[in-house]
Amino acid sequence: ASNFDCCLRYTDRILHPKFIVGFTQQLANETCDINAVIFHTKKGLSVCANPKQTWVKLIVRRLSKKINKM
């Protein structure tokens, strides 16, 4: 769930890496309340995920490796 450019809460679903084309990170500040990873999916959706959860870290690590190879 997001409000303008801010994630307000985290998804309760697990996404597969094949579904994700990229991500951006949201840092908690005066505009946005929570830290979040925003996954960008192949369907053009933005999904707010908890950066502390293992499945999120795994995908971020996998995508970061891909980006570093390019």
């Epitope: 996404l15 597969h16 094949k18 579904f19 192949k42 502390k52 959860q53 499945w55 795994l58």
Partner: antibody
Framework: QVQLVQSGAEVKKPGASVKVSCKAS????????MHWVRQAPGQGLEWMGV????????TYAQKFQGRVTMTVDTSTSTVYMELSSLRSEDTAVYYC?????????????WGQGTLVTVSS | DIQMTQSPSSLSASVGDRVTITCRAS??????LNWYQQKPGKAPKLLIY???NLADGVPSRFSGSGSGRQYSLTISSLQPEDFATYYC?????????FGGGTKLEIK
């Protein structure tokens, strides 16, 4: 070798709760998810939910939300699935299955199954 | 939720036959699909992961193919031990829904 050993068969009355255990061995317990899947007599497979033993994160199928609780005891490499407010339709074999994100999020090892019978 | 539809629901075949089971997703699942085999009274066993990859110890007569919404499992030459029920499963996004199953019987 990888083994998932589940607790024994249970008979419960409608309205009661059941807690099924799944003890893992032969691998690093916190490196893999644990799913719960059930199968009613003569029916297909139904995914109930998953727990990540590394951080106790859970996500459940909508159908079971509010009735199912999955927990983990890392000291004994055991995962538990508790289902409450049992009804006759919950009569099924309940399986735990290891979720391996290294092989496309597949369930690569399964427990032997636990038959839960709900009957008055 | 993503719905998985398997066809046929049952199939009679003979030893040596080539058999194909299909699975259709209600939306594109980008190859995030697994196949399992289950024999009566036993737990399911992983056959194929990621739509096309053979799981460890699975004979090469089994193969998976497909993309988008349409996937298939093929057994190139049926062996007596292959008579069982087969399930596909979506793992793109939770809930990880299964197909209804295909029961493969001896003709």
């Amino acid at each position: 070798q990888v083994q998932l050993v589940q607790s024994g068969a249970e008979v419960k009355k409608p309205g009661a709760s059941v807690k099924v255990s799944c003890k893992a061995s032969g691998y690093t317990f916190t490196n893999y998810w644990m799913h719960w899947v059930r199968q009613a007599p003569g029916q297909g497979l139904e995914w109930m939910g998953v727990i990540d033993p590394s951080d106790s994160y859970t996500t459940y199928a909508q159908k079971f939300q509010g009735r199912v609780t999955m927990t983990v005891d890392t000291s004994t490499s055991t995962v538990y699935m508790e289902l409450s407010s049992l009804r006759s339709e919950d009569t099924a074999v309940y399986y735990c299955a290891r979720g391996n994100y290294g092989v496309d999020y597949a369930m690569d090892y399964w427990g032997q199954g636990t038959l839960v019978t709900v009957s008055s | 939720d993503i719905q998985m539809t398997q066809s046929p629901s049952s199939l009679s075949a003979s030893v040596g036959d080539r058999v194909t089971i299909t699975c259709r997703a209600s939306e594109n699942i980008y190859g995030a699909l697994n196949w399992y085999q289950q024999k009566p009274g036993k737990a399911p066993k992983l056959l194929i992961y990621g739509a096309t990859n053979l799981a460890d110890g699975v004979p090469s007569r089994f193969s998976g193919s497909g993309s988008g919404r349409q996937y298939s499992l093929t057994i190139s030459s049926l062996q007596p031990e292959d008579f069982a029920t087969y399930y596909c499963q979506n793992v793109l996004i939770t809930p990880y829904t299964f197909g209804g199953g295909t029961k493969l019987e001896i003709k």
